[in-house]
Interface confidence: medium
């Protein structure tokens, strides 16, 4: 067959769908793949095919748009179920081609069953809320392209399996969920159940999404290095094996990268001749406070390594810190021998 | 430019089969469906069926499903439909139509094949 | 099945006046998926429009279609002597496609 460039099986895009509700699944060539839209290509004479492969199948396969009740139907570079069926799970490709040019890329399609209470294999997006925070809303999402304007949806709204009515602080809002102000116990799966008409049918699109109650960026502080401190002095004799945690307190801060590192006489442990390794470790608040610990272990410490400066560094969109370990030789314990001549010579 | 160059007229007593031939000259033919619509004398358009050759994977109108068989040749660019158990009221004109692409209109015809049945 | 049901069966009129012909659905036809079809005695049938609105390739802008759901309408403003043919609607968006009985539009 001709020959066709071949963006393979784009497994980024895993798309799951709920069974028996509608889907719109964009073509992923002009969002990722290609530098022009749709429309471009369209009206360079270029067209649009779509074809699948059935699950457990190798075999590829029109997709039949005759389909009673135009069950299945393109529209531009959107491919429209009305609505799924489980045997639609499969490996979808759209390919856009004339007699000169051809690219096609495949992503995989998952239709997905949920039971009475919304539980499913559904991968579910986290939306994160600040704790007494004030009034805060999450959208109920990707349902924009389903309906015109001029349809007005039915909207409701699920905490888990309840109706979210009478609730304390959450308040259905339409198309929004609003916390009055965000709290520990409102940790938990939202659903919002989206009903619409379309000629003469009613469809229900149903959206879960996670909402993680997090630290309030007016309570965020700066990196807090726990230790090293000044009260800790890190005593060794040559031969012994030296460990030295770096344990840091990172307030929660949206899209915040935090870091830590250890530099020895100024460089990156990398960057010095010494046997030197570092191990991790992040635990969480339950508002998604973060501490790191890293612990700096040199196995037989020399003399010189005890003379060295352990600095332990921190970063987060807060600030930068720093803390150096006290670090030095034990010095050896006097010899009998020599406290008695020390003492008659006193004498 | 693209054109479907149809098969002659055919002449076929009831009971038999007929297979009529569209070529595809001048254009990418495996990518686009392939469907065939018949006219009665005076009558109107019926459709049925249509094959999008780079798959090979036909569907058909259930009152000719059975009936109807239809097949590309993808190195001679050329759909078949073949008829079978022909009655009286299968004399029509038979039209293969370009598809513009799996489920757009039928932007280009082949010329028609007259099919008369006859005993 | 969507059943095409087209009005009137003959139009009788003079060149230069417009034509309205009508295509009434059975069922919605979801996705816009309508089209219109001139055919001359002894020819076969040639796209006129297609997506209920688009004019296919060179066709002229004295064709034009409309409405959604289940009403459609082919509008001819200005008819010419090579106008008066029959006109199919045709929905082909749900198995199995079906076309309607047709408009004769015939010179008064």
């Known amino acids: 067959s001709e020959r066709c460039d071949d963006w393979g099986l784009d497994t980024m895009r895993q798309i799951q769908v709920f069974e028996d509700e509608p889907a719109r699944i964009k073509c992923p060539l002009f969002e990722h793949f290609l530098k022009f839209n749709y429309s471009t290509a369209h009206s360079a004479g270029l067209t649009l095919i779509w074809y699948w492969t059935r699950q457990d199948r190798d075999l590829e396969e029109p997709i039949n748009f005759r389909l009673p009740e135009n069950r299945i139907s393109k529209e531009k570079d959107v491919l429209w179920f009305r609505p799924t069926l489980l045997n639609d799970t499969g490996n979808y490709t759209c390919m856009l081609r004339n007699t000169t040019y051809c690219s096609k890329v495949a992503f995989p399609l998952e239709v997905v069953q949920k039971d009475s209470c919304f539980n499913s294999p559904m991968k579910l997006p986290v939306h994160k809320l600040y704790i007494e925070y004030g009034i805060q809303r999450i959208t109920c999402p990707n349902v924009d392209g389903y309906f015109p304007s001029s349809v007005k949806p039915t909207i409701t709204w699920y905490m888990g399996c309840y109706k979210i009515q009478n609730f304390n602080n959450v308040i259905p809002e339409g198309m929004n969920l609003s916390f009055l102000i965000a709290l520990i116990s409102n940790n938990g799966n939202y659903t919002c159940v989206v009903t619409y008409p379309e000629n003469g049918r009613t469809f229900h699109l149903t959206r879960t999404l996670t909402v993680k109650v997090v630290g309030s960026p007016k309570n965020a502080v700066p990196p807090v290095i726990h230790s090293p401190n000044d009260h800790v002095v890190y005593e060794k004799e040559p031969g012994e094996e030296l460990l030295i945690p770096c344990t840091v307190y990172f307030s929660f801060l949206m899209d915040s990268r935090n870091e830590v590192w250890w530099t020895i006489d100024g460089k990156k442990p990398d960057d010095i001749t010494i046997d030197v390794t570092i191990n991790e470790s992040i635990s969480h608040s339950r508002t998604e406070d973060e501490t790191r610990t890293q612990i700096l272990s040199i196995k037989k410490v020399t003399s010189e390594d005890l003379k060295r400066s352990y600095v332990c560094h921190a970063r987060s969109a807060k600030g930068e810190v720093a803390k150096a370990a006290k670090v030095k030789q034990k010095v050896p314990a006097p010899r009998y021998t020599v406290e008695l001549a020390c003492g008659f010579g006193a004498t | 430019q693209v054109q479907l160059l149809q098969s002659g007229a055919e002449v076929k007593k009831p009971g038999s089969s007929v297979k009529v031939s569209c070529k595809a000259s001048g254009g990418t033919f495996s990518i686009y469906a392939i469907d065939w619509v018949r006219q009665a004398p005076g009558q109107g358009l019926e459709w049925m069926g249509g094959i999008i050759p780079i798959f090979g994977t036909a569907n058909s109108a259930q009152k000719f499903q059975g009936r109807v068989t239809i097949t590309a040749d993808k190195s001679t660019s050329t759909a078949y439909m073949e008829l079978s158990s022909l009655r009286s009221e299968d004399t029509a004109v038979y039209y293969c139509?370009?598809?513009?692409?799996?489920?757009?209109?039928?932007?280009?015809w082949g010329q028609g094949t007259m099919v008369t049945v006859s005993s | 099945e969507i059943v095409l049901t087209q009005s009137p069966g003959t139009l009788s009129l003079s060149p230069g006046e417009r034509a309205t012909l009508s295509c009434r659905a059975s069922?919605?036809?979801?996705?816009?998926?309508l089209a219109w079809f001139q055919q001359r005695p002894g020819q076969a049938p040639r796209l006129l429009i297609h997506g209920v609105s688009r004019r296919a390739t060179g066709i002229p802008d004295r064709f034009s279609g409309s409405g959604s759901g289940t009403d459609f309408t082919l509008t001819i403003s200005r008819l010419e002597p090579e106008d008066f043919a029959v006109y199919y609607c045709?929905?082909?968006?749900?198995?199995?496609?079906?076309f309607g009985g047709g408009t004769k539009v015939e010179i008064k």
């Open positions: 069922l919605s036809v979801s996705s816009n998926y």
């Open positions: 139509a370009r598809n513009g692409a799996t489920s757009d209109a039928f932007d280009m």
């Open positions: 045709q929905q082909y968006g749900s198995s199995p496609l079906t």
